[in-house]
């Protein structure tokens, strides 16, 4: 059986579409399943894995790799 | 199970900034973007934009770029959606909704915000 | 930016009836589509997604099909409670339009 594009699995029933944007940041697997493009998490990997360090109650990041700093504090670590 | 509540309905003055507030819970904030929707009366759904939790990141459609501003706060979940300079167009009802897993559109939503704008 | 179409903007029906709603994108969004179910006052509900899938606890005589630009939704048999208005989404890329809405009236 041959699925339809971005659809995978026993019965083509699996839907995966590999997306590099605001959205999402994965390629899909032979399944159907999200693989995460390198400095990405999350069940959608939309979420940007910050510097190693980076205090998570003060810091954050948009991109990879980043810390950026909450109101009041600062730092390379935001610590 | 995901829950979406929504900040109560807004009066407010043409040229005027209105903040709608919607908590979540039932699920880790930061994993999904939250959408914002809105339906003026009597007529259909306009997408205005999303926030990523996480990180701050945002993407806005061109139509309210400059004049809506979403933010979230991780500390308590909640995301907020501030429109400035109102006018009469700018009367609807105001939802908050996040997709739902793998890849589904807007699965949860909130109740709706409306906001009324009228000197 | 894609633009959705959807027709028709209304449409009586009687309960039994077999209904179709068609939406029409202004470029290929791949099977990225969903179909929303609205009652007045209240939030959208999602139907389908992913143009054909079914969401959780909807009933099967709802069915979504289509491909490419082209996409429909079908009722096979009309009950009371499916008397509502009907919006087509497509998800492919920001921004993620709306159809304008169907409404389906009791004849």
């Known amino acids: 059986v041959t699925c339809d594009d971005y659809y995978y699995g026993f019965g083509c029933n699996k839907f995966c579409r590999p997306r590099d944007d605001f959205f999402g940041h994965y390629a899909c697997d032979q399944n159907g399943n999200k693989t995460c493009m390198e400095g990405w998490m999350g069940p959608e990997c939309n979420r940007a894995i910050c510097r190693q360090g980076c205090s998570p109650k003060h810091g954050s990041c948009k991109l990879p790799g980043d810390c950026r700093c909450q109101y009041g504090w600062q730092g390379l670590y935001c610590d | 199970q995901v829950q979406l509540v929504q900040s109560g309905a807004e009066l407010k003055k043409p040229g005027s900034s209105v903040k709608v507030s919607c908590k979540a819970s039932?699920?880790?904030?930061?994993?999904?973007?939250m959408h914002w929707v809105r339906q003026a009366p009597g007529q259909g759904l306009e997408w205005m934009g999303a926030i990523q939790p996480g990180g701050g990141g945002t993407a806005y459609a061109q139509k309210f770029k400059g004049r809506v501003t979403l933010t979230a706060d991780k500390s308590t979940s909640t995301a907020y959606m501030e429109l400035s300079s109102l006018r009469s167009e700018d009367t609807a009802v105001y939802y908050c909704?996040?997709?739902?897993?793998?890849?589904?559109?807007?699965?949860?939503w909130g109740q709706g915000t409306l906001v009324t704008v009228s000197s | 930016d894609i633009q959705m179409t959807q027709s028709p903007s209304s449409l009586s029906a009687s309960v039994g009836d077999r209904v179709t709603i068609t939406c029409r994108a202004s470029g290929n969004i791949h099977n990225y589509l969903a179909w929303y179910q609205q009652k007045p006052g209240k939030a959208p509900k999602l139907l389908i997604y992913n143009a054909k899938t079914l969401a959780d606890a909807v009933p099967s005589r709802f069915s979504g099909s289509g491909s490419g630009t082209d996409y429909t939704l079908t009722i096979s048999s009309l009950q009371p409670e499916d008397f509502a208005t009907y919006y087509c989404?497509?998800?492919?890329?920001?921004?993620?339009?709306f159809g304008q809405g169907t409404k389906l009236e009791i004849k």
């Open positions: 909704t996040r997709r739902g897993y793998d890849d589904y559109p807007f699965a949860y």
């Open positions: 039932g699920y880790t904030f930061t994993d999904y973007e």
């Open positions: 989404q497509h998800f492919w890329s920001a921004p993620w339009t």
